[in-house]
């Protein structure tokens, strides 16, 4: 039993535990009652979203439109915010009742669909404190958490998970690959009060671990001892020259020698041509530079390893996960090729609820979406084949006409006679 029991004297302890779904963590005690839904947006009320979401006041920024795209599982349910202009920055945000995730789990979830076959563009969200001026949200606006997929060229196809810790944006040390196809995908970030995290794509875990291990929030636990240095007599040479080995007396021979078979040409005129010198050839007896044989070094101590000490700068922080204030969700993006659709935003404290919500939204329409896309692709293939056939037919017709123009006029004879005369149909 944990020390938690001391807090509850008398009967009904198990009932309390059960009813409140109390979970005990070493650093924190937190209650998980009804799921708290801090923010939820499915764009199911037509243009209603325009009153909830605020655009940055800048004319050259891209416009979001409400759309379910070129293909979908359910035309109404799959409506979301779609980027509509190429090579633009986008800045759009929605506020909610501010909350703190201290002592509880934080789940951030949304769907992204890059139906444009994206080449370079963001698909991530940022969670800001409520102090953000939404009309002036930009790339340098300080946020708490940034999460989601990002694609740019062949080199970047990743899920960003960035935490602002003590005023600094800290990037994850792992490479989490995002989906780069044209379908809708569900992205989930879970941050727990025991300083662990989980990233899910399509409700399946793709990464998990400890915040302290996978981000450089804190100085390292160990550092190289600054007072230690390699001793002067430390010998790192595994092999040395054999001191007893000596060069054979007949070793030194020139690399090149005059060709013994060469003869002075008969027409050589020393007055005109100078003194004749035979051409040089490689000396077959040349042995190269002599090197003494190698033996094991009796003084070899191995590679010197710098000893480590506890880092005096290091101190653990049990509240890395915690933020005092979340109040705005923002899309602050650049897209070369537009067409990305964002939908089914959810911020909650309940992992199970988020999973359920994902299954009821993305989960319900994903198969039908694929079906519609496959059908469109098939129709496109058929159209392409038809176009190719028509083109071929036109080309054959044109060739026939050309041949007729080129050939002499045909005599009016029967087919049989024509064939006998060697005329062939084009």
């Amino acid at each position: 039993s944990s020390s938690l029991e001391v807090l509850f004297q008398g009967p009904g302890l198990n009932d309390i535990f059960e009813a409140q779904k109390i979970e005990w963590h070493e650093e924190n005690l937190y209650f998980q009652g009804e799921p708290a839904v801090y923010f939820k947006e499915q764009f199911l009320d037509g243009d209603g979203w325009t009153s909830r979401w605020i655009e940055k006041h800048k004319s050259d920024f891209g416009k979001f439109v409400l759309s379910s795209g070129k293909f979908y599982g359910d035309e109404e349910k799959d409506k979301g915010l779609q980027t509509s202009q190429d090579a633009r920055f986008y800045a759009l945000s929605a506020s909610f009742e501010p909350f703190s995730n201290k002592g509880q789990t934080l789940v951030v979830q949304f769907t992204v669909k890059h139906e444009q076959n994206i080449d370079c563009g963001g698909g991530y969200v940022k969670l800001f404190p409520n102090s953000l001026d939404q009309t002036d949200m930009h790339g340098d606006s300080e946020y708490n958490i940034m999460f989601g997929p990002d694609i740019c060229g062949p080199g970047t196809k990743k899920v960003h998970v960035i935490f602002n810790y003590k005023g600094k944006n800290v990037l994850i040390n792992k490479d989490i690959r995002c989906k780069d196809d044209e379908f809708t995908h569900l992205y989930t970030l879970i941050v727990r009060p025991d300083n662990t995290y989980e990233v899910k794509i399509d409700n399946s875990q793709v990464e998990s671990g400890s915040l302290e291990d996978d981000w450089d929030f804190l100085p390292p636990k160990k550092i190289k001892d600054p007072d230690a240095s390699k001793p002067e007599d430390w010998d790192e040479r595994a092999k040395i020259d054999d001191p007893t080995d000596s060069k054979p007396e007949d070793w030194d021979k020139p690399e090149h020698i005059p060709d013994p078979d060469a003869k002075k040409p008969e027409d050589w005129d020393e007055e005109m041509d100078g003194e004749w010198e035979p051409p040089v050839i490689q000396n077959p007896e040349y042995k190269g530079e002599w090197k003494p044989r190698q033996i094991d070094n009796p003084d070899y101590k191995g590679t010197w390893i710098h000893p480590e000490i506890d880092n005096p700068e290091y101190s653990p922080d049990p509240s890395i996960y915690a933020y005092d204030n979340f109040g705005v969700l923002g899309l602050d993006l650049w897209q070369v090729k537009s067409g990305t659709i964002f939908d089914n935003f959810l911020i909650t404290n309940d992992e199970a609820y988020a999973e359920e919500f994902g299954n009821e939204t993305w989960g319900v329409t994903k198969a039908a979406e694929k079906q519609m896309k496959d059908k469109q692709d098939e129709e496109q293939r058929t159209r392409r084949m038809m176009r190719t056939k028509m083109r071929m037919r036109r080309m054959r017709r044109t060739r026939r006409k050309m041949r007729r123009k080129m050939s002499p006029a045909r005599p009016r004879t029967s087919c049989r006679e024509a064939c006998l005369q060697g005329w062939t149909e084009a």
């Epitope: 370079c120 563009g121 963001g122 790339g139 340098d140 990002d150 694609i151 740019c152 060229g153 062949p154 080199g155 970047t156 990743k158 960003h160 003590k166 005023g167 600094k168 944006n169 990037l171 450089d216 390292p220 602050d332 993006l333 650049w334 897209q335 070369v336």
Partner: antibody, heavy 127, light 107 residues
Framework: QVQLVQSGAEVKKPGSSVKVSCKAS????????ISWVRQAPGQGLEWMGG????????NYAQKFQGRVTITADESTSTAYMELSSLRSEDTAVYYC????????????????????WGQGTTVTVSS | SYELTQPPSVSVAPGKTARITCGGN??????VHWYQQKPGQAPVLVVY???KRPSGIPERFSGSNSGNTATLTISGTQAMDEADYYC?????????FGGGTKLTVLG
Amino acid sequence: QVQLVQSGAEVKKPGSSVKVSCKASGGTFSSYAISWVRQAPGQGLEWMGGIIPIFGTANYAQKFQGRVTITADESTSTAYMELSSLRSEDTAVYYCASSPLRGSGWYWHYYYGMDVWGQGTTVTVSS
Amino acid sequence: SYELTQPPSVSVAPGKTARITCGGNNIRSKSVHWYQQKPGQAPVLVVYQDSKRPSGIPERFSGSNSGNTATLTISGTQAMDEADYYCQVWDSSTAVFGGGTKLTVLG
């Protein structure tokens, strides 16, 4: 990894302009930010400005605003830095340097440092 | 505008640990990068994002960043480490370099 090759040394008269080129090879030009950094004889490094070819717009240090123009030609994977109204104090080695973007936002290169540098172009301003 | 302050010179005996500091207002909130420059050569990135080493940079180079000071540490300093070292950060979309520190390896 990308390699950067700069144009040759230049000798210029005060009041004139100089245009230095920086050609990238061995990487995707659009996935880098290109910075221009200069170093006067015996002095430290000084950032002049930079450009992210995929975004097109350049960014300049306050000190050089209005006198420097940085451009990029994606078709030839070449970045250019033009400095006008030259004076003797502009005598320096001019370097181009690239930082990987590793993301679609223009701020990504902040995190990665200038990991590849050109060989430098010496510009001498003298009457 | 943001300023970075480095000591003009630092001396170290071979095999010992060299520390080069870079001071800036609340520098811990920024990503600090360090460059090494040898005479007549272009700078080389030795540490990025405070403490990460690019491939090919020896393990003896490390970095840290807290409060108002970032530090480049070279443990087991070698004669070949003698060079100028510059710290750099980004501030309001502008790159800022420190004035540079000349590292002398004695002996």
